[in-house]
């Protein structure tokens, strides 16, 4: 038995931030689980981890330097990534492992989400031209 995961095919991070929602064919209520987001076709980089446990607060962390937060729904985990760089444009995959109560369950590999990071406009806006020279 495998959990199915649905993700948006593509998201654009205009302000270097994005919300990526991972929707699961499984209710995470009262389960102990580890949801993670992985970068690259080979899922080589673990971007963010959300660890859920019946007795503790949700733990969210990145061991790879990403600025991330996570939010839990009954059948979803939403990853909020901030301070993304243009060169972090890539495909991102949701992964889920449910450990307790048994049996252990993980997911079929999803199709992934292409996150396209658009660079911030660094030019001054015409409405706010910046300080004028004396």
């Amino acid at each position: 038995n495998k959990i199915l995961v649905k993700q948006s095919p593509m998201l654009v991070a205009y302000d270097n931030a994005v919300n990526l929602s991972c929707k699961y064919s499984y209710n995470l209520f009262s389960r102990e689980f580890r949801a993670s987001l992985h970068k690259g076709l080979d899922s080589a980089v673990e971007v963010c981890v959300v660890y859920g446990n019946y007795s503790q607060q949700l733990q969210v962390y990145s061991k790879t330097g990403f600025n991330c937060d996570g939010k839990l729904g009954n059948e979803s985990v939403t990853f909020y990534l901030q301070n993304l760089y243009v060169n972090q444009t890539d495909i991102y995959f949701c992964k889920i492992e449910v450990m307790y109560p048994p049996p252990y369950l993980d997911n079929e590999k999803s199709n992934g989400t292409i996150i396209h990071v658009k660079g911030k406009h660094l030019c001054p806006s015409p409405l706010f031209p910046g300080p004028s020279k004396p």
């Epitope: 102990e32 580890r34 450990m99 307790y100 109560p101 048994p102 049996p103 252990y104």
Partner: antibody
């Protein structure tokens, strides 16, 4: 028939580290079960140390999490336990075991004794 | 952690006796109709051996004199007619929640 054979036990100095091996035969460690390390202090009960899942994910007892690493070498069909900053109370027989789908331990190795003493 | 309490801690019995060991959890270890409670036998100098899994299922090769029962918080291991090879220590284990925990053991000795 699944067989598990632990090795690497012996006398270790306090503050030192241990690295134990568990060679599995009769079953591939990547074939869908989970593999655990459990220990038993002399004359005491059983304590679960942690697991490595068939996916490669690891999972540890919070009481030992900061000092323990479980890994595997798929090509050798072998599991490993690394335990750091050893103290006298880590003296125990260390077992590796296979977990079934509902996390009962259905196969065990013979155990290897680790003694932490100066 | 779920701390399992076994009783008695030790008992003396004779060959042919009916022996009952109990294991109590502070909260239910059931989920969706299944009990995540298992029983092991350990002889001196040997690894534990799985006897009963999921509260009442005998593991492969375990004689029918061993049986398990119970649900929720209270579980029982019964040896219907004690044999000489049954003198050992018995442990219960829960796998409902992490960390996995074991009872403190019940030593069955010869009277």
């Amino acid at each position: 028939e699944v067989q598990l054979v632990e090795s690497g036990g012996g006398l270790v100095q306090p503050g030192g580290s241990l690295r134990l091996s568990c060679a599995a035969s009769g079953y591939s460690i990547t074939s869908g079960h989970h593999w655990s390390w459990i220990r038993q202090a002399p004359g005491k009960g059983l304590e679960w140390i942690g697991d490595i899942y068939h996916s490669g994910s690891t999972y540890y007892n919070p009481s030992l999490k900061s000092r323990v690493t479980i890994s595997r070498d798929n090509s050798k069909n072998t599991l490993y336990l690394q335990l750091n900053s050893l103290r006298a109370e880590d003296t125990a027989v260390y077992y590796c075991a296979r977990k079934d789908d509902y996390y009962a331990f259905d196969y065990w190795g013979q155990g290897t004794l680790v003694t932490v003493s100066s | 952690d779920i701390q399992l309490t076994q009783s008695p801690s030790s008992l003396s019995a004779s060959v042919g006796d009916r022996v009952t060991i109990t294991c109590r959890a502070p909260q239910s270890v059931d989920f969706h109709g299944k009990s995540f409670l298992h029983w092991y036998q350990q002889k001196p100098g040997k690894a534990p051996k799985l006897l009963i899994y999921d509260a009442s299922n005998r593991a492969t090769g375990i004689p029918s004199r061993f049986s398990g029962s119970g649900s929720g918080t209270d579980f029982t291991l019964t040896i219907s007619s004690l044999q000489p090879e049954d003198f050992a220590t018995y442990y219960c284990q829960q796998s409902y929640r992490s960390p996995i925990t074991f009872g403190q053991g019940t030593k069955v000795e010869i009277k």
